[in-house]
């Protein structure tokens, strides 16, 4: 049972056209464009789009009409071929456009970039950007979805209309309000912030699908779709996977038009068919498409059916696993991920995925064996030390955040990853420190039944930030083997890192620890990674120093600041106090 | 009382198809597997299939493409379709309750009463 | 397909009597025990006497016994009771669980 139209077209554009409206397509075609070529101006991709779709145009009138036969990619990769300063913009990029498609797109989306060169995005004052909006609406919102899409070349595109609606409705309620700002600002923090979030989770999926292939996105899919759905028969979940599966490897491949077109068919079904999938669903299926598909994706987990059988008996106790195995390895597997995963909510899907390999890994050996039920009886018992393990980490953790906060938390993760993985760049250990630190006040607060999917779920979420960056300039075996080896045992990999004693530590740079007194203008956060930034660069130098010396130098760099903060000549006593603490600090670590 | 019932049988030409229902009482069928025995009048017992509590279905080499054994663990119900049916068909249809869960161990400590099937122009 | 052959396909015998059936598998039984013995009476389902070979079932009488082990297996009724009057079946398990069989039965009646 496929839900996605089989039937051909004249002319794939016009159809596309058609079935998504003209708002749509070019706000898709907007964000593929933006989403290939970073670094054009948002001016030249306009222009593009506008082109495109007065070609569509003329295709939706006669599908007959010169080069409505060809396909997306031929007619996407040719108009962005057209861009005159290709070369000299993104220099080998350019030698994609000698090649001819499918290879072209496949070069195109080699060259997407996790970290792109571009301006952190400034928020203008709100008066500004209300006159803006008012201004010019389309134009307005046509930007928003331009810097965001080149920031973010795998944002997960019909996702990024929802936020481009929410924007919208941001600026139509707030622009009118008495305190505009009040109104505004908690908004777009809160667009910013999911945002993030959304872009790094599809980023895992997208990593997931390129790196690990389509069977390991569909293990996932299987996985999380089953805790989400555990009233739905296998061969619904089955569907259902195949379906998510094709639309994310369609966004992933820069597919987008057919990615929004194929995820709006798969929302429908999935309400017309919610009686055989969940009763969670009433809600979202009776709102508009954007709304309606975005609901879906973050729906709660149903309720689990009562009586559900002993997983034993069908997985362990029948002498017919072997048979079941080697008739249909995938289906076999992909129905035990199913039992499992519907029976366990509690659980993260990336632990899930390693008792399912460890089930796989044992049948392999035990199926080949003399007397395979004698070999294969106890696998039960080997999931036990995988499931403790997550749990154990996550209890000491959260203990660790609830005693340090956030701040402190993630200064803690700061160090021990840095001394992990000291090569890799301060801004980016900055980052990934942040983040992973951050789990603590969003996962550890739930109760046990939910700590563990929020949380390490999570983290493979932040921890394939790291790996995307760090395969753009690789500079860390440990990081590189922990990120390719296994996608589902990454988290454990490195947590089970220790510190790099092959590491030969960063020379002094007195450079490094001079501030300024701008870090008194800094909102809270920025002056938190300027802070941040100096502790990993501390580690990078004393990758030796105790927890105690780092403490010691932290907080009297705190008082630094504090202190030159409320000088009234503050640039003299940053100059002066400076070169005392970078003394100081040398000397309590032995530098 | 712990009870299997059987339904749905009756007269049907050769060529149809039937559907015959077990209704479990008294227990839950999740958590054994649920075979359907045969026996022709006047014949012996001839085994048909199995499903397991998870769903995973085992048939006689006879069987397999013209039968077709599904549960339904929120009624408490197993049913066994039949196509193609032809007059050697005919024979009372018992559901029975293995000892095992995941397979069919041939040991049925629970049977139903039986239903006829007569396949007849 | 595996055989299960029964024999003697009839007896009669008294009450009182020591009675024994013996059921034979084309192929081993799966575990080299897993063969059940049925007792069914006219117009009644079949009730599960023995399993795996020897256990006997829930409410069976002790004079009831089953041995055997691989492809030979036997029942023995020790001493015939008048209600012990039926047909019985053997039935095994095999390495899957689609190959299922059931002997062709043995019907024991009064002498």
């Known amino acids: 049972r496929g839900v996605f139209r089989r039937d051909a077209h004249k002319s794939e554009v016009a159809h596309r056209f058609k079935d998504l409206g003209e708002e749509n397509f070019k706000a898709l075609v907007l964000i593929a464009f933006a989403q290939y070529l970073q670094q054009c101006p948002f001016e030249d991709h306009v222009k593009l789009v506008n082109e495109v779709t007065e070609f569509a145009k003329t295709c939706v009138a006669d599908e007959s009409a010169e080069n409505c036969d060809k396909s997306l990619h031929t007619l996407f990769g040719d108009k962005l071929c057209t861009v005159a300063t290709l070369r000299e913009t993104y220099g080998e990029m350019a030698d994609c456009c000698a090649k001819q498609e499918p290879e072209r797109n496949e070069c195109f989306l080699q060259h997407k970039d996790d970290n792109p060169n571009l301006p952190r995005l400034v928020r203008p004052e709100v008066d500004v950007m209300c006159t803006a909006f008012h201004d010019n609406e389309e134009t307005f919102l046509k930007k928003y979805l331009y810097e965001i899409a080149r920031r973010h070349p795998y944002f997960y595109a019909p996702e990024l209309l929802f936020f481009a609606k929410r924007y919208k409705a941001a600026f139509t309620e707030c622009c009118q309000a008495a305190d505009k700002a009040a109104c505004l600002l908690p908004k777009l923090d809160e667009l910013r912030d999911e945002g993030k979030a959304s872009s790094a989770k599809q980023r895992l999926k997208c990593a997931s699908l390129q790196k690990f292939g389509e069977r390991a996105f569909k293990a996932w899919a299987v996985a999380r779709l089953s805790q989400r759905f555990p009233k739905a028969e296998f061969a619904e979940v089955s569907k259902l996977v195949t379906d998510l599966t094709k639309v994310h490897t369609e966004c992933c491949h820069g597919d987008l038009l057919e990615c929004a077109d194929d995820r709006a068919d798969l929302a429908k079904y999935i309400c017309e068919n919610q009686d055989s999938i969940s009763s969670k669903l009433k809600e979202c299926c009776e709102k508009p498409l954007l709304e309606k598909s975005h609901c879906i994706a973050e729906v709660e987990n149903d309720e689990m059916p009562a009586d559900l059988p002993s997983l034993a008996a069908d997985f362990v106790e029948s002498k017919d696993v072997c048979k079941n195995y080697a008739e249909a390895k995938d289906v076999f597997l992909g129905m035990f991920l199913y039992e499992y995963a519907r029976r366990h909510p509690d659980y993260s899907v990336v632990l899930l995925l390693r008792l399912a390999k460890t089930y796989e890994t044992t049948l392999e050996k035990c199926c080949a064996a003399a007397d395979p039920h004698e070999c294969y009886a106890k696998v039960f018992d080997e999931f036990k030390p995988l499931v403790e393990e997550p749990q154990n980490l996550i209890k000491q953790n959260c203990e660790l955040f609830e005693q340090l906060g956030e701040y402190k938390f993630q200064n803690a993760l700061l160090v021990r990853y840095t001394k992990k993985v000291p090569q890799v760049s301060t801004p980016t250990l900055v980052e990934v420190s942040r983040n992973l630190g951050k789990v603590g006040s969003k996962c550890c607060k739930h109760p046990e039944a939910k700590r563990m999917p929020c949380a390490e779920d999570y983290l493979s979420v932040v921890l394939n930030q790291l790996c995307v960056l760090h395969e753009k300039t690789p500079v860390s075996d440990r990081v590189t083997k922990c990120c390719t080896e296994s996608l589902v045992n990454r988290r454990p990999c490195f947590s089970a890192l220790e510190v790099d004693e092959t590491y030969v530590p960063k020379e002094f740079n007195a450079e490094t620890f001079t501030f300024h007194a701008d870090i008194c203008t800094l909102s809270e956060k920025e002056r938190q990674i300027k802070k941040q930034t100096a502790l990993v660069e501390l580690v990078k130098h004393k990758p030796k120093a105790t927890k105690e010396q780092l403490k010691a130098v932290m907080d009297d760099f705190a008082a630094f600041v504090e202190k030159c903060c409320k000088a009234d000549d503050k640039e003299t006593c940053f100059a002066e106090e400076g070169k005392k603490l970078v003394a100081a600090s040398q000397a309590a670590l032995g530098l | 009382e712990v009870q299997l019932v059987e339904s749905g049988g009756g007269l049907v030409q050769p060529g149809g198809s039937l559907r015959l229902s077990c209704a479990a009482s008294g227990f839950s069928l999740s958590s054994n597997a649920m075979g359907w025995v045969r026996q022709a009048p006047g014949k012996g017992l001839e085994y048909i299939g199995i499903i397991s509590v998870g769903g995973f279905t085992y048939y006689a080499s006879w069987a397999k493409g013209r039968f077709t054994i599904s549960r339904d663990n929120s009624k408490n119900t197993v049913y066994l379709q039949m196509n193609s049916l032809r007059a050697e068909d005919t024979a009372t249809y018992f559901c029975a309750r293995d000892r095992h869960g995941g397979d069919s161990s041939g040991a049925f400590y629970l049977w139903g009463q039986g239903t006829l099937v007569t396949v007849s122009s | 397909d595996i055989q299960m052959t029964q024999s003697p396909s009839s007896l009669s015998a008294s009450v009182g009597d020591r009675v024994t059936i013996t059921c034979q598998s084309s192929?081993?039984?799966?575990?080299?025990?897993?063969l059940s013995w049925y007792q069914q009476k006219p117009g009644q389902p079949p009730k599960l006497l023995i399993y795996?070979?020897?256990d006997l079932a829930s409410g069976v009488p002790s004079r009831f016994s089953g041995s055997g082990s691989g492809t030979d297996f036997t029942l023995t009724i020790s001493s015939l009771q008048p209600e012990d009057f039926a047909t019985y079946y053997c039935?095994?398990?095999?390495?899957?669980?689609?190959?299922?069989?059931f002997g062709g039965g043995t019907k024991l009646t009064v002498l």
């Open positions: 795996d070979a020897s």
């Open positions: 039935a095994g398990g095999f390495s899957s669980s689609s190959d299922t069989a």
């Open positions: 192929e081993s039984v799966y575990s080299n025990n897993q």
